[in-house]
């Protein structure tokens, strides 16, 4: 192990830290309206928050880097909140043979962690 | 597909968007130097740099999620720069037997992306 | 909250046509696609077909390919379906139900509407 | 088209019995099963979505697992209430079907 341990308890407030939020999205926001039917309103979970040092550190590099922002905060950037997991979901699509059912498998996180 | 294709050329100029840099940091700077034992200076890849739209993205949602932050910037985030693989590296360690070789598969970034 | 109101029951005589309604509210009638499911008596669920109310494309089961037609009213937020050259064995209760969602969940269902088919 | 196979086609319990019931799927379809429950003279009601998710205000004593090809809807104390049919239904792809139907009984 790397003998530093990611923290879960936010030290910046409560919904502060790298947390995930839905979002809510129509096709038209996201471009897709001409070839994505339905639905057409999207329940989109995100990423967003801070990630303060060692919170929810995703691995070793994840630790190290948040290690040597404190040291070099000009030249190693801090972690960020970024998807760990996705959930699935479908959409219905415009075809040229018509209308088909297709799975997005990295449309909508499920997790958060700071990489 | 998602439609909104992932772009590799940097609009920001060179070395502005996300990309892999070499940052040198001691045994000392990681707070390791009491139980690894070798190298004392290790060469970490790390990803930094700027996301902008559609630069490197991971995935369908880090598109979607720079489309959004176009539209609602405060309330989501843009893609930032995280490592998209790794590269393992070896380090001496100091165990209660005496010294040891162990493997770290996620301390050194290999590849970036914006997540 | 989210309902789905069916019209009445119909009685026909075979080869004539019926026409069934479901009308939305509680949610806006055009962010999601209606499907139509029967179901004859004493018998399991069938998938008719599917209509997105925004935009009017349509998939119908292939059985049914030519003798249905599925319509929507965006004004009224209403959905229709009407089935042609009635056979007796279309009879049967029809149910609209609102889904896929992004989740493939069809979580809504009318009422249903008894459709007899007899000479 | 896809057949959704379900067994057993009825099964015969008591109150607070736990209760399976299983469907494949001829192909995978990923997790895109759902369950409902239908009592006589009335409309399916959904129970589980994307094969575990429990529909809002369905009781926890429901749970649904399985992907791929073979899944499980479990009722673990069944009630007097619970007394229906069950059916499964993939939407991995058009046409959507439907499995036969379970009829759960009283003992």
């Known amino acids: 192990s790397a003998h530093l341990h990611p923290r879960d308890s936010c030290p910046l407030g409560p919904g502060r830290c790298c947390h995930l939020e839905t979002v809510q999205a129509t096709l038209e926001d996201l471009g897709w309206s001409d070839w994505v039917l339905s639905p057409r309103q999207l329940q989109l979970s995100m990423c967003v928050g801070e990630c303060p040092h060692l919170y929810r550190s995703a691995n070793t590099h994840a630790l190290i880097k948040a290690r040597l922002h404190g040291l070099q905060p000009d030249r190693v950037p801090a972690p960020c909140c970024v998807p760990s997991s996705y959930t699935p979901v479908v959409l219905m699509h415009r075809t040229d043979s018509g209308v088909s059912l297709q799975t997005y498998d990295d449309l909508v996180a499920q997790g958060c962690h700071c990489a | 597909s998602a439609h909104l294709h992932p772009r590799d050329s940097c609009p920001l100029g060179p070395g502005r968007c996300c990309h892999l840099e070499t940052v040198q940091a001691t045994l000392e700077d990681l707070g390791w130097s009491d139980w690894v034992l070798s190298p004392r200076q290790l060469q970490l890849s790390m990803c930094v740099g700027e996301c902008p739209h559609l630069y490197r993205s991971a995935n369908t949602h880090a598109l979607i999620k720079a489309r959004l932050h176009g539209l609602q910037p405060d309330r989501v985030p843009a893609p930032c720069c995280v490592p998209s693989s790794y590269t393992p590296v070896v380090l001496m360690h100091r165990t209660d037997s005496g010294v040891s070789l162990q493997t770290y598969d996620d301390l050194v970034a290999q590849g970036c992306h914006c997540a | 909250q989210v309902q789905l109101v069916q019209s009445g029951a119909e009685v026909k005589k075979p080869g004539a046509s019926v026409k069934v309604s479901c009308k939305a509210s509680?949610?806006?009638?055009?962010?999601?696609?209606i499907n139509w499911v029967r179901q004859a008596p004493g018998q399991g669920l069938e998938w008719m077909g599917w209509?997105?109310?925004?935009?009017?494309?349509?998939v119908y089961a292939q059985k049914l390919q030519g003798r249905v037609t599925m319509t929507t009213d965006t004004s009224t937020s209403t959905a229709y379906m009407e089935l042609r050259s009635l056979r007796s064995d279309d009879t049967a209760v029809y149910y609209c139900?609102?889904?896929?969602?992004?989740?493939?969940?069809?979580?809504?269902w009318g009422q249903g509407t008894m459709v007899t088919v007899s000479s | 088209d896809i057949q959704m196979t379900q067994s057993p086609s009825s099964v015969s319990a008591s109150v607070g019995d736990r209760v399976t019931i299983t469907c494949r799927a001829s192909?995978?379809?990923?997790?895109?099963l759902a369950w409902y429950q239908q009592k006589p003279g009335k409309a399916p009601k959904l129970l589980i979505y994307?094969?575990?998710s429990l529909q809002s205000g369905v009781p926890s004593r429901f749970s649904g697992s399985g992907s791929g090809t073979d899944f499980t809807l479990t009722i673990s104390s069944l009630q007097p209430e619970d007394f229906a049919t069950y059916y499964c239904?993939?939407?991995?792809?058009?046409?959507?079907?439907f499995g036969g139907g379970t009829k759960v009984e009283i003992k």
């Open positions: 509680g949610y806006t009638f055009t962010d999601e696609g």
């Open positions: 192909q995978g379809i990923s997790s895109w």
């Open positions: 209509i997105t109310a925004y935009s009017g494309d349509t």
């Open positions: 994307a094969a575990s």
């Open positions: 139900a609102r889904g896929p969602g992004q989740y493939a969940d069809v979580d809504v």
């Open positions: 239904q993939q939407a991995n792809s058009f046409p959507i079907t």
